[in-house]
């Protein structure tokens, strides 16, 4: 959960410096890439690579840029108007229902099933029953029951998305 951070909490080099680009608020709000000064008179630019704001706002400070976790790759860097975009490394995925970490994709489908969808950064492999064509959403079977589709060991039990 987020913690409340004020200008006073920030290190001196992170605080709004006098030389930062300023403009005037419009209807009490500052444009993307800026935050409002404490007296409400100025819009102060965010610091490239350090913080950002994506919309018109009345924030007293810009939002901190996300740092990609280990196991993630940086798709695009943080700018003054857009946060860092991180993506799971190849062979791992992040489900919407459990987005806290990248999980290892399964290496194959259970016996009697065929793979119809590859591992992507946002989904595990997708398996369907050979006969019925229905999706599998159960747990990963034991290793000897797994039909391997790529090298490596099966991931820990998990549900398939989709």
């Amino acid at each position: 959960e987020s913690a409340l951070i004020t200008q006073q909490d920030l290190a001196p080099q992170q605080r709004a410096a006098p030389q930062q680009k300023r403009s005037s608020p419009s209807e009490g709000l500052c444009p993307p890439g800026h935050h409002i000064s404490e007296d409400g008179r100025d819009c102060i630019s965010c610091k490239y690579g350090q913080d950002y704001s994506t919309h018109w706002n009345d924030l007293l400070f810009c939002l901190r840029c996300t740092r990609c976790d280990s196991g993630e790759v940086e798709l695009s860097p943080c700018t003054t108007t857009r946060n860092t975009v991180c993506q799971c490394e190849e062979g791992t995925f992040r489900e919407e229902d459990s987005p806290e970490m990248c999980r290892k994709c399964r290496t194959g489908c259970p016996r009697g099933m065929v793979k119809v969808g590859d591992c992507t950064p946002w989904s595990d492999i997708e398996c369907v029953h050979k006969e019925s064509g229905t999706k599998h959403s159960g747990e990963v079977p034991a290793v000897e029951e797994t039909v391997t589709s790529s090298p490596g060991t099966p991931a820990s039990p998990c549900s398939l998305s989709g």
Epitope: E1, S2, N57, L63
Partner: nanobody, 126 residues
């Protein structure tokens, strides 16, 4: 279980005002950012405004800038959206939403939100 209940919608003339409320049943309301979205008939759900968990600072879509004001009462677990100078294009179902994960300071996209109310209809017409 997270429950969000919007109220305050209705029919209003152009230039009029409405105040929407969203009551939350979840105890983490006071530590979470919250957002308002809207969906007009035949269109995709779009971001309107979002407020920080501590209610110090908010985001606004450019289309509502200067006309709408978001606020949050953590003690009452209630989110508000004061809407003024309403226009025909503001006609939509308005939803309040809580994010699906707690590490984003101020989420502003539909996919970042996992808990949604049923919505309240706002109609602006002469």
């Amino acid at each position: 279980e997270v429950q969000l209940l919007e109220s305050g919608g209705g029919e209003v003339q152009p230039g009029g005002s409405l105040r929407l409320s969203c009551a939350a049943s979840v105890s983490t309301f006071g530590t979470s950012p919250v957002g308002w979205f809207r969906q007009a008939p035949g269109k995709e759900r779009e971001f309107v405004s979002a407020i920080r968990w501590d209610a110090v600072g908010a985001y606004y879509a450019e289309s509502v800038k200067g006309r709408f004001t978001i606020s949050k009462d953590n003690a009452k677990r209630t989110l508000y959206l004061q809407m003024s100078s309403l226009r025909a294009e503001d006609t939509a179902v308005y939803y309040c939403a809580l994010p699906r994960r707690g590490d984003s300071e101020l989420p502003s996209t539909v996919k970042e939100y996992g808990y949604w109310g049923q919505g309240t209809l706002v109609t602006v017409k002469p």
